[in-house]
Structure formats: C-alpha cells, structure tokens
C-alpha cells in the first residue's frame, strides 16, 4: 500500500481467483483514543472500533472511503483504491490502446517545436467517475523539472456504438535548451482513477522524436507565363523554432485531386517555393518536416489549383529564412569552410538515417539505457552550439563537434561495427565512417589539435549485443549529426565571411 495523495491510498493486488489479498491497517487521524468507530462509504454499518482498523483487501468491494467517527462526528477519511496486477502485468483497463506507432501505446505526445513544450493525449470510453493526474520530468535518476497543466477533455467522438473521449495535457520543460542534443528522455507519468480502480501509464521520449511541425502557412500561387506550371510559395509556420537558418525544415509539395487514387505531381524541396503542374479540380498541398532529423511530417496545408489566377502572386523567401545580415567573422580562431561543412553534415544526416532507418520502430530505451547513451559525447546546453553562442564565438561549439565526430568515427571503426555480424566497407555504415572522418578533417585547424574524448571500453562479446549496441550508437549519432548540421547550416547562412 502507498499514498497517492493526502488520505488516498493505493493497494496493489495480485488479481487471480482465490487470491489472499492484502492486509491493510488503517489509522484514524485523531488524538482521540477511544469511542472510535469505522464505516465504509455511505453505509452506516460499523466495521470495527478503535484507533486502527485491520482489513483484508481482496476485491473492489473492500475498497472505497473508510471513515472513522466519534459520537456522530467525522474524524478522518482514508480512500482505498485498487491497482490490479494480473499475471505480473498491471491492468490497463481505463485507457484505450492507440496501437500507433506500436501496440500498448496508451499515451501519445507531440511537440510543434524544440522549445520544450509538448502535448500528450490519451483515449478512453469511460465518461464518468474519472480523474487524471500528470507528472513529468527529464530523466528519472536525477530528474529535471517539467511542469504539466491539468488534463482536460479535448474531444469526443462516436466510434460505432461507443463514444470515445480524448483527454490531453500540455507540459513545458522548466529549463529547456532548444539547440542542445538531448541525452536524457522526457518521462511522462499519468495516474488514472476510475471509481475505485487506479492505473498508471508512462511514456518516455526525446522531444526530437515527437516533433511534428504545424503546416506551412500563407500558401500562394503564381502561374508561370506560357507554361502549365505554377510557382507555389509558402512560409514557415509561426510555431516553428527560430531562427530558421538554424532550425530548418524540408517540404513536400503535392498536386492531388480529391481522390488519393488520382494522378499527382510531387516534389521535395528545402526552399519555400516550388514549381509544379496544376490541374483543374486539383489542390496544391505542402507539408513540412525537420530537415536534419526524420521526425513526423506536418499535416498538409492546401490551396485549390483553380484559385491560381486570383491569388496574390509573389514567390517564397527562397531559402530557409532567418538569415539576416552577414555577421562578423569568428573571434579567437580560424573560421571553418561553413558551406562545405554544411554539405557534408547534411550528407551525414542522410547516411545516419539510411544506416539505421528503422530506428523509430524499435524501442531501444530499455533498462540501463541512460548509462549507455551517456557514454557518447553530447552537444550540451553550455557548448555554445546555439545561434547566440555561435555568434559570440563558434570555436567552443566547433571543438565539441570535432570531438564528437572523432569519437563516433572511432566507434564506427571499432569491434562493435567490424565484428560479427559483419558489415561491408561500402555499406551505409562504411560511408558514414568515411564521411565522419572527412568532416572532422575539415574542422581540424592546421597545427591545432583539440583534445578528444576516450572511447569507453564497450566490448560486447555476443553478436546480438553488438547489434543492439550498433542500434543505440546510430540512434545517438542521428541526434548528434542533426545538431551539427543545424550549426553548419546557420554558420553558412550567417557567419560565412
């Protein structure tokens, strides 16, 4: 038994036929010693007398609000809730399994940007006697603060004969660092109480994995002279992180009829304009995704093709925006070849995802994973890799990136990747290895050797251990190169001499 909140207790029960249940001792919160009687819920039947009451809790009939009285006066209450465990598994009767992205997904969370603000939601078919309480933190062993509001009913839907209720909650990390590479996941815990049943649900994620931008805004069409083609332009959504030269998006533009089966035109671009073929009765749609990390695509923003004549023309901003004026060269060190670094780091992002594309479908955050991922270098908040830090002195950040590149380059050349099951040299991992080396050489200033971090002694003996470690390393590498690519893209746009 444990206390959920003041005067509310959860009794954990193994739930099987003829289970002995749990013996619970309730103590009346009073200085009085005698003349105390106990009742349950609205019943006037006296269950016992004395300052303590011992009960055997086996089923829901034994749970409820226990009240101690003296001479018709209520002294205190103790609400007992039951938490069922069947075959070693805690019950999940209150919430509906959303089955996306995998089975046993009860909580789903999304973030519109990297500000540390996110929304979680869940579904239930229960309409009454239902309460939720949400807690969250960054990491679990040494948790950092995340503040969550109250869960509210956000939608009601009819599903066949049933009504389905959607609840949602907004949370905000207290000291968010949008530009940093996350090393500890956000933990979300939801306590659900239905009548006398208690259940808890958890979700663990990195903000980068739950990013889903809002749709692009201000779609405009401009027909091109003497052509079937139309130039479509748009802008970054207002809710996306800034500056856009650092937090860049990529876009998919599609021309589609009302039916998905109809023919279409489709093009991908990093710019905020594209040229497509518009058809009568079709619509032009644009959606967005983080340019350097393969999280979710936004919903589509659409405009009908037929409106192309009357809509205001004007092309998009052409780039990833937010560039502003060219800034001064880097103090205290030579400036890198920003554009070359940008191109190579973007290639690294692509290679990191092609080396391990299924990463999103595998839950590798198992017990002890915080330790594993902390063995690799992370670009942290104080490393100067945020836009302001780069402007002040990019050398700190570049040194950190260089250390990380060398570290991962050594890891990819180590027994973890060279041992069984073997990888061929021109596999994506082989190309990734070579590109990491190439970028680290671009960064290393002449006659200047930065310190490099020691590789931890990770020597898995079994092929399956090696495979698991590869997944985890590539997962971390995807996050690391995404931050590096943002740094170089921003540098190329704003710091190039």
């Amino acid at each position: 038994i444990w206390e959920l909140k003041k005067d509310v207790y959860v009794v954990e029960l193994d739930w099987y036929p003829d289970a002995p249940g749990e013996m619970v001792v309730l103590t009346c919160d009073t200085p009085e010693e005698d003349g105390i009687t106990w009742t349950l819920d609205q019943s006037s039947e006296v269950l016992g007398s004395g300052k303590t009451l011992t009960i055997q809790v086996k089923e829901f009939g034994d749970a409820g609000q226990y009240t101690c009285h003296k001479g018709g006066e209520v002294l205190s209450h103790s609400l007992l809730l039951l938490h069922k465990k069947e075959d070693g598994i805690w019950s999940t009767d209150i919430l509906k399994d959303q089955k996306e992205p995998k089975n046993k997904t009860f909580l789903r969370c999304e973030a519109k940007n990297y500000s540390g603000r996110f929304t979680c939601w869940w579904l239930t078919t229960i309409s009454t006697d239902l309460t939720f309480s949400v807690k969250s933190s960054r990491g679990s062993s040494d948790p950092q603060g995340v503040t969550c509001g109250a869960a509210t009913l956000s939608a009601e839907r009819v599903r066949g004969d049933n009504k389905e209720y959607e609840y949602s909650v907004e949370c905000q990390e207290d000291s968010a660092c949008p530009a940093a590479e996350e090393s500890l996941p956000i933990e979300v815990m939801v306590d659900a109480v239905h009548k006398l049943k208690y259940e808890n649900y958890t979700s663990s994620f990195f903000i980068r994995d739950i990013i889903k931008p809002d749709p692009p805004k201000n779609l405009q069409l401009k027909p091109l002279k003497n052509s079937r083609q139309v130039e479509v332009s748009w802008e970054y959504p207002d809710t996306w992180s800034t500056p856009h030269s650092y937090f860049s998006l990529t876009f998919c533009v599609a021309v589609q009829g009302k039916s998905k089966r109809e023919k279409k035109d489709r093009v991908f671009t990093d710019k905020t304009s594209a040229t497509v073929i518009c058809r009568k009765n079709a619509s032009i749609s644009v959606r967005a995704q983080d340019r350097y990390y393969s999280s979710s695509w936004s919903e589509w923003a659409s405009v009908p093709c037929s409106g192309s004549g009357s809509s205001r023309g004007g092309s998009g901003s052409g780039g990833s925006g937010g560039g502003g004026s060219k800034l001064r060269a880097v103090p205290g060190g030579s400036s890198p070849a920003w554009t070359q670094c940008q191109q190579l780091s973007q290639k690294l992002c692509t290679l990191a995802w092609s080396a391990h594309p299924l990463v999103g479908h595998m839950d590798l955050r198992e017990e002890g994973d915080e330790e594993t991922t902390n063995d690799v270098p992370h670009i942290q908040c104080g490393d100067g890799c945020d836009p302001q830090g780069l402007r002040d002195n990019s050398q700190f950040c570049l040194q950190r990136i260089h250390q990380g590149l060398i570290f991962y380059e050594k890891l990819l050349g180590s027994d973890i990747f060279t041992g069984e099951p073997s990888l061929l040299p021109d596999s994506p991992v082989g190309q990734l290895h070579a590109s990491l080396l190439g970028l680290s050489q671009l960064l290393q200033p002449e006659g200047h050797h930065w310190e490099t971090q020691q590789i931890p002694s990770l020597s898995p003996s079994q092929p399956w251990q090696r495979l698991l470690l590869r997944f985890k390393i590539l997962r971390s590498l995807q996050a690391f190169v995404a931050v590096a690519a943002r740094v170089f893209a921003h540098g190329a746009a704003t710091l190039s001499p």
């Epitope: 079937r228 089966r261 109809e262 023919k263 279409k264 991908f268 671009t269 092609s354 594309p357």
Partner: antibody, heavy 118, light 107 residues
Framework: QVQLVQSGAEVKKPGASVKVSCKAS????????LHWVRQAPGQGLEWMGW????????EYAPKFQGRVTMTTDTSTSTAYMELRSLRSDDTAVYYC???????????WGQGTMVTVSS | EIVMTQSPATLSVSPGERATLSCRAS??????LHWYQQKPGQAPRLLIY???QSISGIPARFSGSGSGTEFTLTISSLQSEDFAVYYC?????????FGGGTKVEIK
C-alpha cells in the same frame, strides 16, 4: 495489369515526320500521365515530354519544343507522339511510359525503333 | 537544365559482391531522384523512387540513399540477373534529365 504496346519500327528520310503510337490497357487511360523518352543506339535516356490524357495538357523538353506534338485518343486509349523535321541524330528507340506520378516513369512500352536515313 | 553525372561509367563486379553506383546533380535536388535498370534489348525498369523508396516486386538487395547533390544506389549482393545498365533521373525541375548510366558487368 498495366500494359503499353507500341507501334512497329519505322524508317524515315531526313526532313520527314514520324508518328509513333502507344496503346494502353489494364487501367483507366485518363488516370495516368504519359511520357515519351528516347534512347539513341548505345546512348543514354532522353526525356521528350508528357501529356495528360484527361485534358490534353502537355509539357515538352525545350530541345523538342516546336518539333514534337503529343496527343491522345481516349476512345481507343492510345497516345501518339509525332516528331517532325527528322534528322539522322533522331535515330533512336522511342519509349512511351505511364505513371500516376508525373515526374518519374513506372510502366514502359516495349519501344519503337525509328531510323532516319537518306 | 540540371545535369546528372553518373560514376563510374563501368563497374566490374563478381557475383555475390556488393556494387555501389554514384549519381551527382549539378545543383541541389533534395530527394527528387529515381533509379532505373535496363538490360540489353529491354525497356528500363524503375528500381527506386525519391532517392530511397523501394518498389514492390523489386528485390530488397537494391537500396538507395542520398539527398541534395550526391546519391548512391547499392546492390548488396549481385546476382547474375543484376548485370545491366543503371540510370539515375532527377525530377526536381523540368526538363526531366537522366544520368549517362553505369554499366555493371561481370568481373
């Protein structure tokens, strides 16, 4: 299944015109874009243009603009590509292809060899 | 127009070995890049679309990667039926253009 069957080989004199046909089957003709791509002997592939059979819209590669005409006959599910003012370097295999997506080529015809020789 | 350059022009590989074919665009084309296989006397066949998307019916040994200006087609373990010419094609803008092709031949 989706199939494209092209007309037979042609031999033409320089300055003449050629009209290659491409009969579609296995799908609703107006549901796919139709492209024409050619390949000179021992050479690579060269895109010529596309047509939307639903409305007759076309887009031609600048190199062929003014010399090529793409048409369709929806009643027979047939596409045509006419190339005028033929030169010896127009000697090639001409392929028609169809796709629901405009910008790449999913289903190909077997090809029609057009020889331009005096 | 966007110029597509493939390398090498010819690649000699033994059956069972891995083949890596490169394609470079003269300007950034995001992932608007498609790969085709052509055997002698046959029409080309679509293998990969949008840089890395696989086609149903195409063996899993064919995979694509890349974005921007550099792209790769990888055949993980060459089978006898894979010896052919491979073309890349950009769809970023009209006119649509192809690379010159890479001939994969038996070593």
């Amino acid at each position: 299944q989706v199939q494209l069957v092209q007309s037979g080989a042609e031999v033409k004199k320089p300055g003449a015109s050629v009209k290659v046909s491409c009969k579609a089957s296995g799908y609703t003709f107006t549901d796919y874009y139709l492209h024409w791509v050619r390949q000179a002997p021992g050479q690579g592939l060269e895109w010529m243009g596309w047509i939307d059979p639903e409305n007759g819209d076309t887009e031609y590669a600048p190199k062929f603009q003014g010399r090529v005409t793409m048409t369709t006959d929806t009643s027979t599910s047939t596409a045509y590509m006419e190339l005028r003012s033929l030169r010896s370097d127009d000697t090639a295999v001409y392929y028609c292809n169809a796709n629901k997506e405009l910008r790449y080529f999913d289903v190909w015809g077997q090809g029609t060899m057009v020889t331009v020789s005096s | 127009e966007i110029v597509m350059t493939q390398s090498p022009a010819t690649l000699s590989v033994s059956p069972g070995e891995r083949a890596t074919l490169s394609c470079r665009a003269s300007q950034s084309i995001s992932i608007n890049l498609h790969w085709y296989q052509q055997k002698p006397g046959q029409a080309p066949r679509l293998l990969i679309y949008f840089a890395s998307q696989s086609i149903s019916g195409i063996p899993a040994r064919f995979s694509g990667s890349g974005s921007g200006t550099e792209f790769t087609l990888t055949i993980s373990s060459l089978q006898s039926e894979d010896f052919a010419v491979y073309y890349c094609q950009q769809s970023n803008s009209f006119p649509l253009t192809f690379g010159g092709g890479t001939k994969v031949e038996i070593k």
